[in-house]
């Protein structure tokens, strides 16, 4: 997944944000638990503004928003990434 | 390995539109997070984004230039097209086709292709 | 739309010298900056990314750093290859932007 000439980390988020994401901007996440040389859970997302970002794991809005995602019978499995993909 | 090549008119006059071409290869258009751009760089002068398209051919512009930019793509033959209307003397510059890729750790324009040098000149 | 303001938009330094190029952004954009640098005659490359990332095979006498909406790239210690211009990129949102750049000699 990382860019050849990135590849310098074993984590991929150098650092992470906590503020809140909108659902609505939210194109894609990935949840990925520790392991493959980065001892911390890692979660990407992708928004339809064409950036991908890192966000706290422990984030409230965060655990509420995988609920829901969840709930909607998107699974968030490591390296699967949850797809939201907006309505052409 | 990835490359990009940019080709135009080397001169084009005032008011004409200039079409530039992106050929690439290393990397496709198809896959979700790839995109293509230009950017463009008067001599001696800075950089200047314009504009870029990705996969889903979701494009975004310079609002600066928006009127006069169309961006686009042809995934199949890897390449992407820039054309810009009505163009005059500040137009000219090295025009430069750039890669990105939304992966992370997310580094927009990442690759880079050598530049074609434009020339608006009456 | 967010302004870069460079500075300086040149310098010139002695090979071993310390030097530090600026750039100030007009409004927030975190960690959504690169440094590129770019020789003579050739494309720009990406040389730090998230302000503070080092690209591979970027040698370590350069460094970033991020103090508010301040932004720094500072060389260790300067060496002949180093010769080139510097330009800062803010990819936190479209448009994206860039410095005016600094164009860093040989004194």
């Known amino acids: 997944i990382l860019e050849a000439h990135y590849t310098n980390l074993k984590c991929r988020c150098s650092g992470v944000i906590s503020t809140v994401v909108g659902l609505n901007i939210i194109d894609r996440i990935q949840v990925t638990p520790p392991g493959n040389g980065c001892p911390k859970t890692e979660v990407v997302i992708w928004t339809k503004m064409k950036k991908v970002i890192c966000v706290n794991p422990r984030a409230k809005w965060l655990q509420r928003l995988l609920r829901h995602v969840q709930s909607k019978s998107l699974s968030s499995t490591p390296q699967a990434p949850v797809s939201k993909r907006r309505a052409a | 390995q990835v490359t990009l090549k940019e080709s135009g008119p080397e001169i084009l006059q005032p008011s004409q539109t200039l079409s530039l071409t992106c050929t690439f290869s290393g990397f496709s258009l198809s896959p979700y997070g790839m995109g293509v751009g230009w950017i463009r760089q008067p001599s001696g002068k800075g950089l200047e984004w314009l504009a870029n398209?990705?996969?889903?051919?979701?494009?975004y512009y310079n609002p600066s230039l928006i009127n006069r930019l169309t961006i686009s793509k042809d995934t199949s033959n890897n390449q992407a097209f820039l054309k810009i209307t009505n163009v005059d003397t500040t137009d000219s510059a090295t025009y430069y086709c750039?890669?990105?890729?939304?992966?992370?750790?997310?580094?927009?324009?990442?690759?880079w292709g050598q530049g074609v040098m434009v020339t608006v000149s009456s | 739309d967010i302004q870069m303001t460079q500075s300086p938009s040149s310098m010139s330094a002695s090979l071993g010298d310390r030097v530090t190029i600026t750039c100030q952004a007009s409004?927030?954009?975190?960690?959504?900056l690169i440094w590129f640098q770019q020789k003579p005659g050739k494309s720009p490359r990406p040389l730090i990314y998230?302000?503070?990332n080092l690209a591979n095979g970027v040698p370590s006498r350069f460094s970033g750093r991020r103090s508010e909406s301040n932004y720094s790239l500072t060389i260790s210690s300067l060496e002949s290859e180093d010769m080139a211009d510097y330009h800062c990129l803010q990819f936190k949102q479209y448009p994206y932007t860039f410095g005016a750049g600094t164009k860093l000699e040989l004194k």
């Open positions: 398209i990705w996969w889903d051919d979701d494009k």
């Open positions: 998230y302000a503070t």
């Open positions: 409004q927030d954009i975190g960690n959504d």
């Open positions: 750039v890669r990105s890729e939304l992966v992370m750790p997310y580094v927009p324009f990442d690759y």
